[in-house]
Amino acid sequence: EEELQVIQPDKSVSVAAGESAILHCTVTSLIPVGPIQWFRGAGPARELIYNQKEGHFPRVTTVSESTKRENMDFSISISNITPADAGTYYCVKFRKGSPDTEFKSGAGTELSVRAKPS
């Protein structure tokens, strides 16, 4: 059987300041069991962008319906983009455990921010 893949189809996304950025992510399987999280950057200093369980992420909304069964679309939208949001965003699948452990990461989507049109 094929192992779960994390697919970030967009290598890069360019958004005007003040607009919203949609970062696409899908997985190919419902298992292994465990959450999806979004990060900016890689390595130990990476910044958590969205986690469904803990934290407050007022600028982030999920693209898929909150009641969608067997959801495999973990795309997010980040509102009111500023130049400070530029960077590479990773969709990461975790395997459930104590604690959860990283299972597989998407290839990343680089977000660049254009100047707000005058």
């Epitope: 059987e1 192992e3 779960l4 399987s29 419902l30 298992i31 292994p32 069991v33 465990g34 959450p35 999806i36 469904q52 369980k53 999920t62 898929s64 319906e65 909150s66 009641t67 969608k68 069964r69 067997e70 959801n71 973990f74 395997r95 459930k96 455990g97």
Partner: antibody
Framework: EVQLLESGGGVVQPGGSLRLSCAAS????????MTWVRQAPGEGLEWVST??????YYADSVKGRFTISRDNSKNTLYLQMNSLRAEDTAVYYC???????????????WGLGTLVTVSS | EIVLTQSPATLSVSPGERATFSCRAS??????LAWYQQRPGQAPRLLIY???IRETGIPERFSGSGSGTEFTLTITSLQSEDFAVYYC??????????FGGGTKVEIK
């Protein structure tokens, strides 16, 4: 139509072993996590164990004694129960996991159950 | 471990009446709560998930509400086949998945 059919229950002495099976049909078995839930006579529901792909999870009450496994080529879920105790006496249900959006698992289809009695 | 407390343990209702019972979680589970019905001698059946979404094929007389720590299952106009035990289950934080102790709905 989703169907789950448990087998392998019976009477066993304390300290003994049993292997339960759950034959699944009507859905893509390998794509879903599967779970065992038990119900002691006259009591409520108690989660026992869940398996994803290689990932397995157990209730503290059975950890180290029970082993959950699956054979996707046979569409079958198993529960190997060792060192059985009187308090393991229950109807054991196999259930298919379902998820909603970004959340955890609940159980949308259940088998009819198989009775395990641990008694000397 | 999240503890779910269901009340009342038993509810006596006449056919055609409304039944309302609750499930209280020991900590916030957001909307990650399901309700099951278990008729005598049968396996549990999923009624509601995500606190308020009816499973396909479940009659409209069943409705779920609440979020966080307080949840309610309501059955309007009880039918004879609704006399059963009802369990809530949280899937916000696991393992373990936890179930409430159940509410038995009996004929008055």
């Amino acid at each position: 139509e989703v169907q789950l059919l448990e087998s392998g229950g019976g009477v066993v002495q304390p300290g003994g072993s049993l292997r339960l099976s759950c034959a699944a049909s009507g859905f893509s078995f390998s794509n879903f996590a599967m779970t065992w839930v038990r119900q002691a006579p006259g009591e409520g529901l108690e989660w026992v164990s869940t398996i994803g792909s290689g990932d397995t999870y157990y209730a503290d009450s059975v950890k180290g004694r029970f082993t959950i496994s699956r054979d996707n080529s046979k569409n079958t879920l198993y529960l190997q129960m060792n060192s059985l105790r009187a308090e393991d006496t229950a109807v054991y249900y196999c259930a298919k996991d379902s998820t909603v959006s970004w959340s955890g698992d609940f159980f949308d289809y259940w088998g009819l159950g198989t009775l395990v009695t641990v008694s000397s | 471990e999240i503890v779910l407390t269901q009340s009342p343990a038993t509810l006596s209702v006449s056919p055609g009446e409304r039944a309302t019972f609750s499930c209280r979680a020991s900590q916030n589970v957001k909307n990650d709560l399901a309700w099951y019905q278990q008729r005598p001698g049968q396996a549990p059946r999923l009624l509601i998930y995500a606190a308020r979404i009816r499973e396909t094929g479940i009659p409209e007389r069943f409705s779920g509400s609440g979020s966080g720590t307080e949840f309610t299952l309501t059955i309007t106009s009880l039918q004879s086949e609704d006399f059963a035990v009802y369990y809530c289950q949280q899937y916000y934080d696991w393992p373990p998945f936890t179930f409430g102790g159940g509410t038995k709905v009996e004929i008055k």
